[in-house]
């Protein structure tokens, strides 16, 4: 009867340049428990070479050498006994492509190269990427431990050189950034920066790299608040904005931070569990009216933590003038001139262009002024007779603008003409 | 037992071909590299060649690479040498051995078989 | 191609004595897995040639062990402690290193 020598492995396998690959195999050979029990071994040849000659690619015989290219990158896994002949084959290079044949022997008996079931190997070029392993989401000051790792690569071959490429690692030590796993600590500016872990073997020509951008979770550190596209300036998590009562107002609050902040507008000063007016970053008020003076908080709430800001609003007008409209009074010629503005106006007499400054010392004429509401009034009482024409004016100012009217008296006439003449500061 | 039986040979004309065989048995065929050694009358021996069935592996000593011709048919398990164009300096008793294991040596002769060319 | 010079060309000795035969090589028989196929064949009369010694010292079976191979690199050393009616014959050193494989001219072991 003939002798049963089999085996079961796969006709193909194909494995990238510088990865590994595990070749199941088994097999069967004839052999009697009655037969002496010399050891068993087993060989995997390149094919083409001759047993008796060949170095080994793999083998469990000490006394057989092993091709100084396939040492310690082709092994044997599994137990020979068992009639295991996995090959494992590691750091794949491109001349290992190619057949192979197993062959077993014990003793005199069984000596057998499976010539029927070659094992073709191809080995193509590395286009496996490394993978960048680290707990997600990356949080801003707290040190993660970043790895980088082949899948497919094994430790078989020469040691795998790795560098870390990116703005996020600049303050590490170059030493750091040459092993598989480190320790970032990252910042608010690194979210959206790249990280790079290049992988190179060792004395060999394969590299492969894998790129990620982080995403760094932070809270936010700075609001901005713009008007019209231009920042308000903050001092002390205070801003200050002046507002044209009457005006339409829209503001954008900005706080950046990863992931986006809830960004949200209240009224004065809120509590943390205050109604917002507003849900979004913007607070438009069509018009500002004196009322809403006081202040207006944005607040950014993020899983990381809050911010907000104080907007100080100051609602201004510039000066509304009344008259001036002048009178005769038994004391003289009365003028009277009302004013309203935010903030409270200043306001002048001129007579022939010339200042009425206080109360004249000679009793020629005297000013006084009262307020009411938002309006202020200002008399003034010219003593004596008109000798000519005369051009009486008032003018109320604050730092936005100014308002002045005027009125001439002529001589004779009872019936006086004003007119009001706005004027800009 | 291996065992290897040669047959072939004879008298034969100058310039014609002549086919020796090697029958092998006893062992798995392709499990040994078969070996042609050559031993002129009173001579020495002379390695012509090996076949070897496991890969079908042919090496040839250069001098005789135009002289002889190895095959095999595995399934008869038997190796032959065609020598061609003989002359008077192809006379000689031609043995096949069987090599098998690492140790390198020719560990199974043939009983040889004699080739005359003459007219 | 390797040249294998065997010495002396004839051995005369008398049963019981020892007999060396050398064998040289124009060089090294080192193959490139490491091993020295260097070989001893005893070729009686009609008969084909016999294993006696394989890798240099190696006895092949059945081989008594008066037969003993020495040797390294290029000079290589075949004894026969007692030598037996048995013995006589041509002896070949032999390499199987580099192809082409070549046989030593042999060395007649006869009776005195």
């Known amino acids: 009867e003939k002798p049963v020598y089999e085996l079961q492995v796969q006709k193909s396998v194909t494995v990238q340049e510088g990865l590994c690959v595990l070749v199941p195999c088994s097999f069967s050979y004839p052999w009697r428990s009655w037969y002496s029990s010399p050891p068993l071994y087993v060989y995997w040849f390149r094919d083409g070479e001759i047993p008796y000659y060949a170095e080994v690619v793999a083998t469990n015989n000490p006394d057989r050498r092993v091709k100084p290219e396939t040492q310690g990158r082709f092994r044997l896994l599994g137990d020979v006994q068992k009639k295991n002949c996995s090959l494992s084959i590691g750091d794949a290079r491109m001349e290992d492509t190619g057949s192979y044949f197993f062959r077993v022997e014990r003793g005199r008996d069984v000596k057998y190269s499976y010539q029927q079931n070659k094992l073709n190997l191809e080995v193509t070029a590395l286009i496996e990427k490394p993978d960048i392993h680290f707990l997600e989401p990356l949080e801003s000051g707290r040190p993660t431990r970043l790895s980088c790792s082949l899948p497919g690569s094994c430790e078989a071959g020469p040691p795998l050189t790795f560098s870390w490429t990116g703005n996020a690692l600049s303050p590490l030590d170059p030493e750091t950034t040459r092993s598989s796993e480190l320790t970032l600590t990252p910042r608010p500016e690194d979210h959206g920066t790249n990280l790079t872990c290049q992988m190179k073997r060792q004395g060999a020509q394969v590299t492969t790299e894998r790129t990620v951008q982080l995403n760094v979770s932070y809270a936010p550190q700075t609001i901005t608040i713009f008007r019209n596209g231009i920042a308000l300036e903050i001092l002390q998590n205070t801003s200050y904005l002046p507002v044209l009562e009457g005006q339409a107002l829209r503001l954008l609050c900005d706080a950046p931070s990863n992931p986006p902040a809830h960004l949200s507008w209240f009224q004065g000063s809120p509590a943390l569990n205050a109604t917002p007016i507003s849900n979004t970053g913007i607070l438009e008020l069509r018009r500002v009216r004196s009322a809403e003076e006081g202040g207006f908080t944005c607040r950014a709430q993020h899983p990381l933590g809050f911010l907000q800001i104080f907007l100080n609003l100051s609602v201004y007008s510039l000066p509304q003038l009344l008259g001036p409209s002048c009178s005769w009074e038994a004391e003289g010629l009365h003028c009277r001139c009302s004013f309203r503005a935010r903030p409270a106006p200043s306001l002048c007499w001129r007579l022939e262009e010339k200042p009425l400054e206080g109360n004249s010392s000679q009793g020629s004429f005297k000013v006084n002024s009262s307020s009411a509401g938002p309006w202020a009034n200002s008399s003034l009482i010219l003593h004596g007779g008109l000798s000519s024409d005369l051009k009486v004016s008032c003018k109320a100012w604050n730092i936005y603008g100014s308002q002045s009217g005027s009125v001439l008296l002529l001589q004779g006439r009872s019936n006086l003409g004003t007119g009001v003449v706005p004027a800009a500061l | 037992q291996v065992q290897l039986q040669q047959s072939g040979g004879g008298l034969v004309k100058p310039g014609t071909s002549v086919k020796l065989s090697c029958k092998a048995s006893g062992y798995i065929f392709t499990e040994y590299i078969i070996h042609w050694v050559k031993q002129r009358s009173g001579q020495g021996l002379e390695w012509i060649g090996w076949?070897?069935?496991?890969?079908?592996?042919?090496k040839y000593n250069e001098k005789f690479k135009d002289k002889a011709t190895l095959t095999a048919d595995k399934s008869s398990s038997t190796v032959y040498m065609e020598l061609s164009r003989l002359t008077s300096e192809d006379s000689a008793v031609y043995f096949c051995a069987g090599h098998e294991g690492y140790d390198g040596a020719m560990d199974y002769w043939g009983q040889g078989t004699s080739v005359t060319v003459s007219s | 191609d390797v040249l294998m010079t065997q010495t002396p060309l004839s051995l005369p000795v008398s049963l019981g004595d020892q007999a060396s035969i050398s064998c040289r090589s124009s060089?090294?028989?080192?193959?490139?897995?490491?091993?020295?196929?260097l070989e001893w064949y005893l070729q009686k009369p009609g008969q084909s040639p016999k294993l006696l010694i394989y890798k240099v010292s190696n006895r092949f079976s059945g081989v008594p062990d008066r037969f003993s191979g020495s040797g390294s690199g290029t000079d290589f050393t075949l004894k026969i402690s007692r030598v037996e009616a048995e013995d006589l014959g041509v002896y070949y050193c032999f390499q199987g290193s580099h192809v082409p494989w070549t046989f030593g001219g042999g060395t007649k072991l006869e009776i005195k």
């Open positions: 060089q090294s028989i080192v193959h490139s897995n490491g091993n020295t196929y």
């Open positions: 076949f070897y069935p496991g890969i079908i592996s042919i």
